[in-house]
């Protein structure tokens, strides 16, 4: 990735240098070093400050975004004197030609689409490409499928996420000939992307006074146990007047998922649907399919 | 219902091994992940280890590394923990449980605890 | 010595309203990790009372609440009953010991 780095030194410089692919910033050792700190500013002045690395030379910034662009500083005190460098890192190219819209969702347990647009001011021939890292950094991830409107990339389709970790960094890079794109980056918790499948293997058995539905927890991306699960269960009448409210009932996940409901012979024919959300960002996946139960003469 | 059924109590010699085993009925062993916990009237709860699924492994805790093994069969949904070279401060209950949540690990359910005495 | 610290214990009348702390760190709750808490009547397995810091199992009646702020977490019990005279465990992840840390348990008297 190419990017206009530019250090502000003092006459004696510590040639701080920063690698995007690792995120690691490192500078020059000084003997003697009583003192080492470094830490970026972002543009609305937030401050990161991540630990030195064991050498006390290099640190490595975790979560961090770059596109809005950030200025690294490195504070070096040795027996003799004090060091400070600041290196500026801006998202070089034309403002306005970085990706736009971005957004990923897994989805079936373990595929993922991620969309974006053109920027706004870039021009025709621009391309773009997807880069993805885990929060381990061990692996790079390239788009292995893009998905593309009138011959630029404006998605990706992955059909293998054995690299992803629970927390994830998207990068975005662009290239023309003509002027230099800017790029845009992004963290992601797959938890907060991942849409579940409706719950599966939907029964329901009824006797002479109650109806028991059960249900087996959707499969998942996430490793999730069933502790992690809220489902919401749809039992309707059927032909019942428009606008009649169908019951809706909040069920906990619990190791045999299960709800049992009063219902007593003759029963009128009834549907029951499922859907299942991640308990703690309650994104619910789309409806089980119907399930009837009782007859119409009931 | 799901139920956690662990062997019976056990009376070791210092510097033996003692394994410990924990059927699980209502459910396939394959689709859960079991943890082990022991308690002492004097430290407490101590959690050992289980199966972590960032890692996809069974992990333990550092405290009992290199002294403890964790096992399942999942064919007769049953999981085992050995502990070796036993000493008097590891007499406690033992405790396997099913792991509800992978967000703060809560318990749920229990075994009924199998008590392990050390003693010369 | 728990990681979590707890009170050894507490005490009152029948339908009062009791509640315990749990005081953790800045690896555990304050990671933030999830709080559970447990009942361990004499002689039994512990009994989930509460998971995801406030959230209650099926089959847990609502006299039993909790919450959690910072690095501590507590548990509400309203309406005190003499079957909740018992042992009370804090539970949380910790992020330096990679694994379960629990608190040194609180005995609930019911006077």
């Known amino acids: 990735e190419k990017s206009d780095l530019r250090t502000v030194a003092p006459a004696s410089s510590l040639n701080v240098r920063f690698d995007s692919r690792t995120m690691n910033l490192s500078w020059d050792c000084q003997e003697n070093t009583t003192f080492s700190k470094c830490f970026l500013t972002d543009k609305k002045n937030r401050v990161v400050e991540p630990r030195l690395s064991n050498n006390e030379c290099s640190c490595t910034f975790r979560e961090i975004c770059l596109h809005e662009g950030v200025t690294f500083e490195v504070h070096v005190n040795t027996s003799q004197r004090g060091f400070q460098q600041k290196l500026l890192y801006p998202n070089s190219g034309r403002e306005g030609t970085a990706a736009q819209n971005f957004s990923c969702f897994i989805y079936n347990a373990d595929l993922m689409n991620c969309t974006w647009a053109r920027g706004p001011t870039a021009p025709r021939d621009v391309q773009y490409f997807l880069y993805i890292r885990n929060s381990k950094r061990r692996r790079e991830i390239r788009c292995p499928y893009y998905i593309q409107d009138s011959g630029t990339h404006v998605g990706c389709h992955l059909d293998n996420l054995s690299g992803l970790t629970s927390r994830n960094y998207f990068l975005v890079n662009g290239t023309s000939r003509e002027i230099g794109i800017q790029f845009f980056d992004s963290l992601l918790d797959t938890k907060k992307i991942e849409r579940f499948n409706p719950p599966s293997n939907v029964t329901v058995r009824c006797n002479t006074t109650h109806c028991l539905v059960r249900w087996k927890q959707p499969r998942t991306y996430q490793k999730l146990s069933y502790l992690d699960f809220q489902y919401q269960l749809d039992v309707h009448r059927k032909n019942t007047q428009p606008g009649t409210e169908n019951l809706l009932i909040n069920v906990s996940g619990d190791l045999e998922n299960r709800y049992n409901f009063p219902s007593s012979e003759p029963r009128a024919k009834h549907s029951v649907k499922i859907r299942a959300a991640d308990v703690r960002i309650l994104n619910w996946s789309s409806w089980s399919e119907a399930i009837e139960f009782g007859s119409d003469d009931g | 219902q799901v139920q956690l059924v662990q062997s019976g109590a056990e009376v070791k010699k210092p510097g033996a091994s003692v394994k410990v085993s924990c059927k699980i009925s209502?459910?396939?062993?394959?689709?859960?992940?079991i943890h082990w916990v022991r308690q002492t009237p004097t430290k407490g709860f101590e959690w050992m280890g289980g199966f972590d699924p960032e890692e996809n492994e069974i992990v333990y805790a550092q405290r009992f590394q290199g002294r403890v093994t964790m096992t399942e069969d999942t064919s007769i949904d049953t999981a085992y923990l050995t502990l070796s070279s036993l000493r008097s401060d590891d007499t406690a209950v033992y405790y396997c449980?099913?792991?509800?949540?992978?967000?703060?690990?809560?318990?749920?359910?229990w075994g009924q605890g199998t008590m392990v005495t050390v003693s010369s | 010595q728990a990681v979590l610290t707890q009170p050894s214990s507490v005490s009152g009348a029948p339908g009062q309203r009791v509640t315990i702390s749990c005081t953790g760190s800045?690896?555990?709750?304050?990671?933030?990790?999830?709080v559970s808490w447990y009942q361990q009547l004499p002689g039994t397995a512990p009994k989930l009372l509460i998971y995801?810091?406030?959230k209650r199992p099926s089959g847990v009646p609502d006299r039993f609440s909790a919450s959690k702020s910072g690095t501590s977490a507590s548990l509400a019990i309203t309406g005190l009953q003499a079957d909740d005279e018992a042992d009370y465990y804090c539970q949380s992840y910790d992020s330096s010991l990679s694994g379960s840390v629990f608190g040194g348990g609180t005995k609930v008297t019911v006077l």
């Open positions: 209502g459910h396939s062993l394959s689709e859960l992940s």
């Open positions: 800045g690896s555990n709750i304050g990671a933030p990790y999830d």
């Open positions: 449980a099913i792991v509800g949540s992978f967000s703060g690990y809560p318990y749920r359910p």
């Open positions: 995801h810091n406030n």
